[in-house]
Each structure stands twice: as structure tokens, then as C-alpha cells.
């Protein structure tokens, strides 16, 4: 059964993907496709490495992580609800049937309907402050407690800092990690 | 146009070995996945192996793993299969079959070879 | 390894019947499905790729169906030059598998 991660409409996507290198700079290619893992290759491919770069991608597709260090989840730029559905992660280790595969299912929902805040200060103080961070399993819901007022661009550098770290300390704790050698 | 043409076939003794090619044309060979399937006297198809585009990842039936061989030179456009230990069993006409492409999305033997046929007798 | 099953094992048939073969495979394999049609001392030949698509050439009449574990291959309008063996085959798991065949024979 697939893992599943959920986004808004309007919002970018992330599929998280891992493995480790065998050797610095020692990269594996690696594929994402729209549809579930078949037995060769990743279905419709959206974006492939080589062992070297990011060597073919399509539009609103990229990889946001450092992928020299095997860190190749996927962004999706402004999904829509056509978004929604299977996706695969296919690490491409040379040998006789090593390839590993990981299929991910995207939630897509659609935009919370809000009001437009009259001003910054009646903004702050109905913000929620929590941040839903999708790990492995189900998702997880990190309450941020009292916090003084935040602008919506400190939000967004909280939340990449909090999945940065937390996200991908978890993710490979939990054994999303493909290890190389 | 798509060609592919397997030679290589022929009677061998049961415990010997053969070596079965595939010359590809009209199409980057380099781009595709590449199989080989076979069947026997009268009866159904069977995936052999398959190959990935620079001969990296191999994948193989596992009765057949530990006694057949798929490769590919690019170079040459061409596709191989090593058959050792051959059995009355692996008698059968062996196809060269071009598969999934770059991008994906064509999930099919979507071009064949007239085949080949490989008699293991005493 | 996932079997695929075909039904029926052989069919007679007229020029201008309709023809359903099934196929079934044992787990989920989503669309990753591909039909042939083998004639007697020919390699086969691609008429629908992942579950649906018809191949490059194929006639119109030709057509697929299903995803899943259950999957149709339908001739609307026989003609002489179908009447051959036609397989199933998954892409999804491996091995690759086919099923055994369904032998559409003339009435």
C-alpha cells in the first residue's frame, strides 16, 4: 500500500524520497513517474538523475533537496486537483534486480476559502500557529505554542526549516533511506 | 524502420552453451529497455531477461539467473543472450523484444524479432 | 509472482461477431497490462498497450479495457485475419508474466 501525503491546491507538493551514497558524489540514477512503481523505469517520468545531474524534468517538477547527498524528494510546484494520485520513486542501483521502489500517494485538496485580513496585526492573531509537517506515517502536527508575531515570510522559513530538519531527520529514521554499499 | 533481427540459435547437447544475438536498426537503441522472451513448441510466452539502456541493470526470471546472461553494446546496437548449462527444457524460439522507452509510458513489447530457435538435444 | 489468467482458453467465432477475452491477474497491477495477437510461425504482435491504448497500426475495432486485477481485450467486428492466439502480459511485478493464451478459432 502506498504512503500517502497530502497538499492544497495552490500549494507545492512534497514526496519525500532517500537513499545514501555509497561514496560522496557516487550518485545512483533515480526516476519519478505519475503512476505506481512498474516493474522497470517509473511510468509516465516526470524527472530523472544520472549519476551525475538532473539530466530530464518537466514543468512544476523539481528536486528541492540536495540530491548529490541522496536526497531526492520531489517538489510539485502549484498543484491542482488533477495533481492528485500515485507517484514513484524508483532508485535505479546498478546490478541484478536492485533496483528499490517507493509508491507515494498525493492527496490533493482543495484551498481553504478565507477571508482577506484587514490588517497585519488581526492576521497575527488568527493565525493558528501550527504546522503540519507529512512524514512516513500518518501526519504529524507540530504546535509551535506562543509565539511573538510572525510575518507570512517568517512562516515560510519556519515551516522549510522545520521540514528541512525534523522532516528528513524523521523520514530517514523511519526507514524511507535506501542505503548504497 | 524498426528491425530486429536474432541469430545464434541451432542444435546444441544438453550441458553446453550458446550464444544468441540481437541486431537492432531504426530506432536509438540506446533508449530503450531491451528483453528477451521465448517459447516453447506449442506453447505459451515466457519473459527470459530484460536489460536497461547502458547494460547497468539486469533482470531475469529466477530459474534462468544463475545460467543465462542478457547484455547489450551500444555501440553496435546489439543484444545478447549467454545460455550455459542448456537443458532439454530451454528448448524453445527465443525472441529479442524492444521494451519501455526513456520517458516511460509504453508499457509493452511494442517491436519483435522473427525469433530464433534453440534445440537442446542429445 | 503474479499469474494471469485468461479466459476463455479458446473461442470460435464468425467473421462480424463480437469477442471479449478477459484476463486476471493475480494482484494489482494498476494499468502496466499489454494484449498480443501471435499467428502460427509469426512472433507476436502489440495491439493495446497499458490496458487501453491501442499500438501504432492496430485497427480501430481493436480495444482494451480494465486496471486493477480485471482486464478486457474486445474485437466489435471480427475479420478473417483475427482469427490467431491472443496473450495477456503484466508489466508490474517480476517477473513478467503472460497468461496462457485464448486460441479465437473460426466457427
Known amino acids: 500500500s502506498e504512503v500517502e501525503y497530502r497538499a492544497e491546491v495552490g500549494q507545492n507538493a512534497y514526496l519525500p524520497c532517500f537513499y545514501t551514497p555509497a561514496a560522496p558524489g557516487n550518485l545512483v540514477p533515480v526516476c519519478w513517474g505519475k503512476g505506481a512503481c512498474p516493474v522497470f523505469e517509473c511510468g509516465n517520468v516526470v524527472l530523472r538523475t544520472d549519476e551525475r545531474d538532473v539530466n530530464y524534468w518537466t514543468s512544476r517538477y523539481w528536486l528541492n533537496g540536495d540530491f548529490r547527498k541522496g536526497d531526492v524528494s520531489l517538489t510539485i510546484e502549484n498543484v491542482t486537483l488533477a495533481d492528485s494520485g500515485i507517484y514513484c520513486c524508483r532508485i535505479q542501483i546498478p546490478g541484478i534486480m536492485n533496483d528499490e521502489k517507493f509508491n507515494l500517494k498525493l492527496v490533493i485538496k482543495p484551498a481553504k476559502v478565507t477571508p482577506a485580513p484587514t490588517r497585519q496585526r488581526d492576521f497575527t492573531a488568527a493565525f493558528p500557529r501550527m504546522l503540519t509537517t507529512r512524514g512516513h506515517g500518518p501526519a504529524e502536527t507540530q504546535t509551535l505554542g506562543s509565539l511573538p508575531d510572525i510575518n507570512l515570510t517568517q512562516i515560510s522559513t519556519l515551516a522549510n526549516e522545520l521540514r528541512d530538519s525534523r522532516l528528513a531527520n524523521d523520514l530517514r529514521d523511519s526507514g524511507a533511506t535506501i542505503r548504497i554499499g | 524502420e524498426v528491425q530486429l533481427v536474432e541469430s545464434g540459435g541451432g542444435l546444441v547437447q544438453p550441458g553446453g552453451s550458446l550464444r544468441l544475438s540481437c541486431a537492432a536498426s531504426g530506432f536509438t537503441f540506446s533508449d530503450y529497455y531491451m528483453a528477451w522472451v521465448r517459447q516453447a513448441p506449442g506453447k505459451g510466452l515466457e519473459w527470459v531477461a530484460n536489460i536497461n539502456y547502458d547494460g547497468s541493470s539486469t533482470y531475469y526470471l529466477d530459474s534462468l539467473k544463475s545460467r543465462f546472461t542478457i547484455s547489450r553494446d551500444n555501440a553496435k546496437n546489439s543484444l545478447y543472450l549467454q545460455m550455459n548449462s542448456l537443458r532439454a527444457e530451454d528448448t524453445a524460439v527465443y525472441y529479442c523484444?524492444?521494451?519501455?522507452?526513456?520517458?516511460?509510458?509504453?508499457?509493452?513489447?511494442?517491436?519483435w524479432g522473427q525469433g530464433t530457435l534453440v534445440t537442446v538435444s542429445s | 509472482d503474479i499469474q494471469m489468467t485468461q479466459s476463455p482458453s479458446s473461442l470460435s467465432a464468425s467473421v462480424g461477431d463480437r469477442v471479449t477475452i478477459t484476463c486476471r491477474a493475480s494482484?494489482?497491477?494498476?494499468?502496466?497490462l499489454a494484449w498480443y495477437q501471435q499467428k502460427p510461425g509469426k512472433a507476436p504482435q502489440l495491439l493495446v498497450y497499458?490496458?487501453?491504448t491501442l499500438a501504432e497500426g492496430v485497427p480501430s475495432r481493436f480495444s482494451g479495457s480494465g486496471s486493477g486485477t480485471d482486464f478486457t481485450l474486445t474485437i466489435s467486428s471480427l475479420q478473417p485475419e483475427d482469427f490467431a492466439t491472443y496473450y495477456c502480459q503484466q508489466h508490474y511485478g517480476s517477473p513478467l508474466t503472460f497468461g496462457q493464451g485464448t486460441k479465437l478459432e473460426i466457427k
Open positions: 497499458n490496458a487501453k
Open positions: 494482484d494489482n497491477i494498476y494499468s502496466y
Open positions: 523484444a524492444r521494451d519501455v522507452g526513456y520517458y516511460g509510458g509504453n508499457y509493452g513489447f511494442a517491436y
